[in-house]
Interface confidence: low
């Protein structure tokens, strides 16, 4: 019988154990700092711990706070060792403090909705302001138990840094509780209340007959009229009016964790799912040389696009990369800033039939609201950590 460990499949000093119960016939026990089926992936050191299961170590957005892990595939905790929560209502139930759970269906598969006691009004019946939450607000890591409107969604940590996505929406309407719950609440269906998460839209989704076709023809440079609807993602902006230079139109810079081996597919998935979710045309922008505007993070160019300032105490592990990403990296996951063009031509008061956020700031609030209620992460190929809107500018005058 062939010994599966004979070929020494474990890298970086990992020890091999033959086991019939494993898909590969062996298990590698990896040394500290490495992970993956063959210990080939570096688990980045992140302060006093390592980011497991492909998690990415990111500098804290706040000086004086430790770096943190951005976890993949539903894993959580400071080291990304907490296993993913089951989809839907579990068990265990995602609703805390005796909240009752009901299953919902949506783009990302089974979801859930909690009916909560009045004393714990968060989307998962959390108690904002609970003991232990004071020091965690705004530290860059979303603590679900501290997330709710009372604590500004853990100081913005659970809402893409936006302290109150529902600012301007009458607070006693509590539209944050009704947002994207699958039922239409007309009192929340307004710009300031983020259109009730589009729960009032009909049809709510691209018809199955069109969906595959529209997927296959999404942002391919040709306008597919049957896909040029809000529910089908406006064909990824392929049908947008030609009157403006798209290079200078509105855009969103997204900080997202993705896996480079499948980057193209993930960028496509990101653009399409956000187009369908936000009901606006979105696509990965190209620079003047025709390259995707996708930049590794941390990195100077990425942070410039995010509009943020660097923490001077953070040392880059590599020289800042100023070029758009080549596909040469082979690490399990990495942070990227993705610049997406946005077609808002169908939104706004002139298009009452197409109700969608008509400026990039409103798009940010909508995404922040989705993040706050836990509706965003299940849809995306990797965690979305930050969003920076650009309203669009006039192109510079020709230099003679």
């Amino acid at each position: 019988e062939i010994d599966p460990c004979h070929s020494q499949p474990c890298f970086h000093g990992g020890t091999c154990e033959a086991t019939a119960g494993s898909p590969l016939g062996f298990i590698c026990h990896c040394p500290k700092g490495f992970e993956g089926p063959t210990c080939s992936h570096r688990a980045p050191s992140c302060g006093f711990h390592h980011c497991h299961h492909g998690g990415l170590c990111l500098p804290s957005p706040k000086p004086g706070f430790p770096p943190r892990c951005a976890c993949l595939s539903g894993y959580g905790g400071p080291d990304c060792l907490t296993p993913p929560a089951p989809k839907g209502c579990g068990p265990p139930s995602p609703c805390l403090y005796n909240g009752s759970c009901s299953e919902t269906t949506g783009l990302g598969g089974p979801g859930f909705r909690c009916s909560c006691p009045h004393s714990s009004p968060g989307p998962r019946c959390q108690k904002p302001g609970a003991k232990g939450c004071e020091g965690r607000s705004g530290d860059g890591a979303c603590d679900a138990g501290c997330s709710g409107p009372g604590g500004n969604w853990d100081g913005g940590d659970c809402s893409l840094g936006v302290p109150d996505p529902w600012k301007g929406c009458p607070s006693h309407s509590r539209c944050w509780l009704l947002f994207r719950d699958g039922q239409c609440h007309p009192q929340c269906d307004s710009e300031e209340c983020l259109f009730d998460g589009y729960d009032c839209e009909t049809p709510p989704a691209c018809t199955p007959a069109y969906d595959q076709y529209c997927h296959d023809h999404f942002h391919n440079g040709h306008c597919e009229k049957g896909c040029n609807t809000a529910e089908c993602g406006w064909d990824g902006g392929d049908c947008r009016p030609e009157d403006g230079d798209p290079e200078w139109g509105p855009s969103l810079a997204l900080l997202v964790v993705l896996s480079p081996p499948a980057l193209d597919q993930q960028l496509f998935a990101l653009a399409r799912v956000l187009s369908l979710t936000l009901r606006v045309g979105l696509w990965v922008r190209k620079d003047r040389d025709g390259r995707d505007m996708v930049y590794p993070y941390p990195g100077a160019r990425a942070e410039e696009k995010l509009g943020g300032t660097r923490d001077p105490t953070y040392q880059e592990r590599a020289a800042p990369q100023t070029q758009p990403l080549g596909k040469e990296t082979d690490s399990l996951s990495a942070g990227f800033v993705v610049v997406m063009g946005v077609d808002l031509s169908r939104c706004g008061p002139d298009h009452p039939a197409s109700r969608c956020p008509w400026d990039p700031g409103l798009l940010l609030r909508f995404l922040a609201a989705m993040a706050a209620v836990g509706a965003l992460e299940p849809l995306l190929p990797g965690p979305l950590l930050a969003v920076h809107p650009h309203a669009g500018t006039a192109p510079p005058a020709n230099q003679l």
């Epitope: 006691p117 009458p170 039922q183 007309p186 269906d189 009452p352």
Partner: antibody, heavy 115, light 107 residues
Framework: EVQLVESGGGLVQPGGSLRLSCAAS????????MSWVRQAPGKGLELVST????????YYANSVKGRFTISRDNSKNTLYLQMGSLRAEDMAVYYC????????WGQGTLVTVSS | DIQMTQSPSSLSASVGDRVTITCKAS??????VAWYQQKPGKVPKLLIY???TRHTGVPSRFSGSGSGTDFTLTISSLQPEDVATYFC?????????FGQGTKVEIK
């Protein structure tokens, strides 16, 4: 102080029409959903129609669908209910109210449908 | 449509008594329930919303509880000015519906 003042009620024959108005003051009218609720003499409360803050979404009770139209003019801080093909069972006091937990109500206007 | 069934339809109690009115929803409405008081010839007045939040200016003797399908309005110590009809209402989903009312009188 929040104030809602209805007007436009009165006596109308079956099959006739009326237009009710509700003048709002004391709050940012354009930020709130508004509703019409009615109460037949000696009976309970019934939601007639609701409109969201910008007028883009409306709801009607099955009993009035196709006969009544709710609208609003945010520049005039006014809510309207256009009632057509009126029937005896539409006879009630009509209240305009703010929000889904109706914290504020007008004093009501009586609609009498009789030949 | 979601039915809201109130009980009892009427009750008579003495001043100082604890009074409980219940409302049962025909399906889960979370905590999207309000309670109103309507005195004869007057406009309904909001007492409780989100099942247990007292509206501004409502005396503390009024309290609400419940979630899902079963809701309760309690008057901890009945006062003469509490003589009225009380309605529950769900606003979880359209059409928002009211209970048929509970008439409260003093013995």
């Amino acid at each position: 102080e929040v104030q809602l003042v209805e007007s436009g009620g009165g006596l109308v024959q079956p099959g006739g029409s009326l237009r009710l108005s509700c003048a709002a003051s004391g709050f940012t009218f354009s930020s709130y959903g508004m509703s019409w609720v009615r109460q037949a003499p000696g009976k309970g409360l019934e939601l007639v129609s609701t409109i969201n803050s910008n007028g883009g979404r409306t709801y009607y009770a099955n009993s009035v669908k196709g006969r009544f139209t709710i609208s609003r003019d945010n520049s005039k801080n006014t809510l309207y209910l256009q009632m057509g093909s009126l029937r005896a069972e539409d006879m009630a006091v009509y209240y305009c109210a703010r929000d889904q937990g109706f914290a504020y109500w007008g004093q009501g206007t009586l609609v009498t449908v009789s030949s | 449509d979601i039915q809201m069934t109130q009980s009892p339809s009427s009750l008579s109690a003495s001043v100082g008594d604890r009074v409980t009115i219940t409302c049962k929803a025909s399906q889960d409405v979370g905590t999207a329930v309000a309670w109103y008081q309507q005195k004869p010839g007057k406009v309904p007045k909001l007492l409780i919303y989100w099942a247990s939040t007292r509206h501004t200016g409502v005396p503390s003797r009024f309290s609400g509880s419940g979630s899902g399908t079963d809701f309760t309005l309690t008057i901890s110590s009945l006062q003469p000015e509490d003589v009225a009809t009380y309605f529950c209402q769900q606003y979880s989903s359209y059409p928002w519906t009211f209970g048929q009312g509970t008439k409260v009188e003093i013995k």
